[in-house]
């Protein structure tokens, strides 16, 4: 819920601090899933939905983009997942549950989701650090 | 016992550049963030810029142009280099620890004064 | 940039005696009922030593006497009572938002 205070209730130079160590692992995420899974797609079916509708400058969503990371976790590189989800811990609200999120069973449908899910982030982090670089909070 | 320890030449030419080291002991610099701020003659602190736990670098836009500031993990190690110094740049440089638990700098080095004259 | 502006820039008080230094900021650095303005001292030839962070907390090994009050863009930090090793300059330091920035620093004398 809005109202709700963050876990650690970070200041804008601490989520900046956050939003520069997400940015090289997520551009890296995905340009070596695009190398290793030539000719798929984008999927028009899934979107994550991470930035926070309820706050100017936007944040980032991040109880909205944590399940989708735990989700393709075990299909992707663990390794930098594991680094992406430690980052999203810092700035997840406290008590908002996390859905659960299910890849898709067909390999091609699911490498597809995955896809979409780093490109999307990647522009949420794009959009984010925008934000915090135009001026005042 | 967290030390910071800086050292560099004392006095830099005009144009030039300025390089220091931050040899830190007691901690890590792969955890936490790892700081340079300088202090000018008439006692104005100014805040430099960062590198993280990760090797990400952020600087402040006043300076972005001229400072790079890199680490050497196997010496645990940080350095700031400044280029194109000026008169304006005469100053004493400390290394500093971001401490998580304050967001403040816990520790800092004693400070390394540094004259760009000709 | 938030500005960070101090009072008074020097200060003189008797032995014994309190000290209060006033630092404001330009804009709130405030998030969530939390402050992040921090208190330092140096003293001469020394590096400066974090006294009092997020506005309220004492630093570990500092001293009881020291302590600091404030939210939003008001602080204060107070010295009582103030003893003959307090001569030093104080600044106020946000770290709030980017780039971080410093109060010009007031300097406590003994009268």
């Known amino acids: 819920s809005s109202h709700m205070a963050p876990t650690h209730q970070l200041p804008p130079s601490d989520v900046r601090k956050i939003i520069l160590e997400l940015q090289p692992l997520s551009r890296g995420l995905l340009e070596d899933y695009q190398k290793k899974e030539t000719g798929v797609p984008e999927s028009n079916r899934t979107l994550l939905l991470c930035l926070t509708s309820d706050s100017q400058p936007p944040r980032l969503n991040s109880s909205a983009i944590l399940p989708y990371f735990r989700a393709i976790r075990p299909l992707s590189d663990k390794n930098i997942i594991d680094k992406i989800i430690e980052q999203l811990d810092k700035l997840k609200f406290q008590h908002e549950p996390e859905t659960e999120i299910s890849v898709p069973a067909d390999t091609f449908e699911c490498k597809s989701f995955i896809l979409t899910i780093l490109q999307q982030f990647s522009a949420c982090l794009e959009s984010v650090f925008k934000s915090l670089n135009s001026g005042p909070q | 016992e967290v030390q910071l320890v800086e050292s560099g030449p004392s006095l830099v030419k005009p144009g030039g550049s300025l390089r220091l080291t931050c040899s830190v002991t007691?901690?890590?610099?792969?955890?936490?963030?790892w700081k340079w701020i300088r202090k000018f003659p008439g006692n104005k602190l100014e805040y430099m810029g960062y590198?993280?736990?990760?090797?990400?670098?952020d600087y402040n836009p006043s300076l972005k142009s001229r400072i790079t500031i890199s680490r050497d993990t196997s010496k645990n190690q940080y350095y700031l280099q400044l280029n194109s110094v000026t008169t304006e740049d005469t100053a004493t440089y400390y290394c500093?620890?971001?401490?998580?638990?304050?967001?403040?700098?816990?520790?800092w080095g004693q400070g390394t004064s540094v004259t760009v004259s000709s | 940039d938030i500005v960070m502006t101090q009072s008074p820039a020097s200060l003189s008080v008797s032995l014994g005696q309190r000290a209060t230094i006033s630092c404001r900021a330009s804009e709130s650095v405030d998030t969530y009922g939390r402050s992040f303005m921090h208190w330092y001292q140096q003293k001469p030839g020394q590096s400066p030593k974090l006294l009092i962070y997020r506005a309220s907390n004492l630093e570990s090994g500092i001293p009881a006497r020291f302590g600091g009050s404030g939210s939003g863009t008001d602080f204060t930090l107070t010295i009582d009572p103030v003893q003959a090793d307090d001569v030093a300059t104080y600044y106020c330091h946000q770290s709030y938002e980017d780039p971080w920035t410093f109060g010009g620093g007031t300097k406590l004398e003994i009268k």
């Open positions: 007691g901690d890590s610099i792969t955890s936490g963030y």
């Open positions: 500093a620890r971001y401490a998580n638990y304050g967001y403040a700098m816990d520790y």
């Open positions: 590198i993280s736990y990760s090797g990400i670098t």
